[in-house]
Amino acid sequence: MKVLQEPTCVSDYMSISTCEWKMNGPTNCSTELRLLYQLVFLLSEAHTCIPENNGGAGCVCHLLMDDVVSADNYTLDLWAGQQLLWKGSFKPSEHVKPRAPGNLTVHTNVSDTLLLTWSNPYPPDNYLYNHLTYAVNIWSENDPADFRIYNVTYLEPSLRIAASTLKSGISYRARVRAWAQCYNTTWSEWSPSTKWHNSYREPFEQH
C-alpha cells in the first residue's frame, strides 16, 4: 500500500482543516488508514482522524482544531496499521479556504432597488471576520448568457443594485462566496442560491 498523491490540506481558519490524498489503488480509507495530527506546541497531544473515502483510491479527513492562530503548525503522520506511509507538516494560516457565507436573502421591496444581504460565516472574535470580501453571482434561469459577477470589496455583507439592471418579469438566482486577501486564501464554496422574480416599473417615456 502506497500513497500516490500526498495529502494536501486546507483550513477554514476556525475549527476544521480538510486533508485529501490518493492511494495507489482502491482503499477502504476508514478501516485501513489513520491520519495522526499534532500541534507543534509544548505539552500538546496527538489526535487521530479517521478518513473517509473520496472516490475509489481517494481519502479525505476532517481535522478538528480548537481554533487557529497564524503561528500554528501541525505535524501529520499517515499510518496503515503499524506502517508509516507518509510524514509531513501543515500550517493552517498558509492554506486557508474560508467558510461559505450563509443566509443569502434578496429584499425586493425597496423602490426598484434590489438589496442582497448575507451572513459573515465567522464570529466577531475570529481574525477573518473583518477581512472577508465577497463575490456575488447573479444569473437568469431563462437565459444562460445573462450571468454576472459583482465584487463586494467593502466589509459589509450586502449589495445594492438597481432592479432595472436586470430584465423584468423573469426569475433570477443569486449566490455569494468569500475570500480574504490578508491570507491570500482561495475562494470559499458558493453559498446556497436564492431565487426571486424580478419585476419593476418601467420608467414612463416622454416623447
Epitope: L39, V40, F41, L42, S44, D66, D67, V69, A71, D72, N73
Partner: nanobody
Framework: QVQLVESGGGLVQPGGSLRLSCAAS?????MAWFRQAPGKEREAVAT????????YLADSVKGRFTISRDNSKNTLYLQMNSLKAEDTAVYYC???????????WGQGTLVTVSS
Amino acid sequence: QVQLVESGGGLVQPGGSLRLSCAASGDFYCMAWFRQAPGKEREAVATIRSGGRSTYLADSVKGRFTISRDNSKNTLYLQMNSLKAEDTAVYYCAVGVDGNCRNYWGQGTLVTVSS
C-alpha cells in the same frame, strides 16, 4: 528587552491552593509554566496559546492546576489546587515565539508544600 516577573509563591499546606502570576512585557504565541524540584530537571507544567483558548497540562497536574492568561494585561496565571508535597519546586514563567515556549525566562518563584 523582554521582562517576565513572577509572583505568588510561598509556603502552603498539602491540599491547599496557590495562584502564581507572571507579568510579561509583550504578547507571545506560547506562554508556559515550568518547575524544577531540588535535584531534578526542569519540566513543563502547563502551556497556553495566544488567544488563551487552548491550554495544555502535564499529566501530573491534570485536574488540579489550570493555566490562564489575561491578554489585556499580558499576564499569565497558574491556579494550583490540591497541592501535594511533590509539587514543591521553583516555578518559572517562560514565553516563546514558537511552540517550544523557551525563548525567555523569568527568575522563578519558590513554592513549598509542607505541613
